[in-house]
Interface confidence: low
């Protein structure tokens, strides 16, 4: 998505099917106030947006209200009524979903079930990833809804837990982002804690797709 | 131009199945999503359900969950609705449309299939 | 699920006015509302798409407002060929849900 026109990068990114943020790194405008241009339809006329992100004072973006939007974006950014980079993108192959909202853990012994609230459109993978202090590395488990079971849990040590959402890329197209993490919960013998204590810095979680 | 063209209507006794095809031409079948609607003159239209022909995923609504089955053939471009254990009030016309992969609107239309369910 | 109430089954106009037809949502489905066309003997027709899109080809007599719960669809000079049901559509969450439909009676 990031080819250039005269030096233009541009990312796109749709907030759970409800904002589109496009920005514009253009190092040959970087003291300019470029303006983004944009409509939805291939025959209506353009609009101007009207809510820039700025940076050192200069335009470096645009968000477009744009709740589940059937369609392809077709934007100009320019410099006066120059044009320094046209395209037409699906704005849904930028999909970044929202956070898991209202978490929620089950346990059973030696398995725990984290649950949440599923988004309101389909074809995502709700992934879960743990660890203990004596793991090396993030365990993963993932399902299709918000509802994941992990067994094989020692009761007597202290998990730490958090959970995304990932859009499946068989739907969606290779370029969608995942959620940001859920925060960390550390649990003990079905309790939760303010954190596994012996725990070391975990390492980066794994952010394959 | 897009086209969803349907199978032809079907008279059939109460207690058996049918399946309906709709074969889809003029754009990239796995691109869309292809959505069931029925039409009776009691209950107006009725979404049934989605499928993705790309990974055959299906979305029911649970009140046709033991009625309907979607499934796609995607080397001919073709999402099938098969309905099971029809009774009188399965009579109707059934549609499908297409939307994008994920959801939004129905933009296409197929011209629909009469299912008669008479003894 | 979310249920969606046309509340008039029948509305009578006559050529050149101006009629709305509306419809309700049980639940918040922000704009992501569909609203068909159904000529007698026909196949739906989609019209507007996210409450207030026209398709392309739909003429602009036909407009799409509102967000949330309430909704409306406005003809303005409404002509002969627009003697029709319209169906109001949410595809906010599944199952999606169509309205029960208003059929425009041309005088």
């Known amino acids: 998505q990031g080819g250039a026109a005269e030096g233009v990068q541009i990312q796109i990114i749709y907030f759970n099917l409800e904002t589109v943020q496009v920005t514009w790194n253009a190092s040959k405008y970087s003291r300019t106030n470029l303006t983004f241009h944009y409509r939805f339809n291939g025959d209506e006329a353009y609009d101007q947006c009207t809510n820039y992100l700025l940076q050192e004072g200069h335009t470096s973006g645009c968000l477009l209200d744009a709740e589940q939007r059937d369609d392809i974006l077709y934007f100009s950014i320019r410099n006066g009524t120059h044009p320094v980079f046209t395209a037409s993108r699906w704005m849904v192959y930028y999909l970044k979903p929202s956070s898991p909202k209202h978490v929620r853990f089950s346990w059973h012994q030696d398995a725990v079930t984290v649950t949440c609230s599923d988004l309101s459109y389909g074809d995502l993978l709700y992934e879960v990833q743990y660890r203990s202090p004596f793991d090396t590395e993030w365990q993963s488990k993932q399902e299709n809804t918000c509802n994941v079971t992990i067994e094989g849990l020692d009761a007597e040590k202290c998990y730490s837990f958090w959970v995304r959402v990932k859009a499946m890329e068989d739907v969606y197209g290779p370029d969608t982002y995942p959620s940001d993490w859920s925060e960390v919960t550390c649990w003990q013998r079905g309790e939760i804690r303010d954190a596994c204590a012996e725990t070391p810095t975990p390492p980066k979680p794994k952010l394959s797709k | 131009q897009v086209q969803l063209q349907q199978s032809g209507p079907e008279v059939v006794r109460p207690g058996v199945s049918v399946k309906i095809s709709c074969k889809g031409s003029g754009f990239t079948f796995t691109d869309y999503a292809i959505h069931w609607v029925r039409q009776s003159h009691a209950k107006s239209l009725e979404w049934i359900g989605i499928?993705?022909?790309?990974?055959?995923?299906?979305n029911c609504d649970q009140k046709f969950k033991d009625k309907a089955t979607m499934t796609v053939d995607k080397s001919s471009s073709t999402a099938y609705l098969d309905l099971a254990r029809l009774t009188s009030e399965d009579s109707a016309i059934y549609y499908c449309?297409?939307?994008?992969?994920?959801?939004?609107?129905?933009?296409?239309w197929g011209q629909g299939t009469l299912v008669t369910v008479s003894a | 699920d979310i249920v969606m109430t046309q509340s008039q089954k029948f509305m009578s106009t006559s050529v050149g006015d101006r009629v709305s037809v509306t419809c309700k949502a049980s639940?918040?489905?922000?704009?992501?509302i569909a609203w068909y066309q159904q000529k007698p003997g026909q196949s739906p027709e989609a019209l507007i798409y996210s409450a207030s899109y026209r398709y392309s080809g739909v003429p602009d007599r036909f407009t799409g407002s509102g967000s949330g719960t309430d909704f409306t669809l406005t003809i303005t000079n409404v002509q002969s060929e627009d003697l029709a049901e319209y169906f109001c559509?949410?595809?906010?969450?599944?199952?999606?849900?169509f309205g029960g439909g208003t059929k425009l009676e041309i005088k």
């Open positions: 449309s297409r939307s994008r992969v994920w959801g939004g609107s129905l933009a296409y």
């Open positions: 639940q918040n489905v922000g704009t992501n």
């Open positions: 559509q949410q595809y906010k969450s599944y199952p999606w849900t």
């Open positions: 499928i993705r022909p790309s990974n055959g995923n299906t």
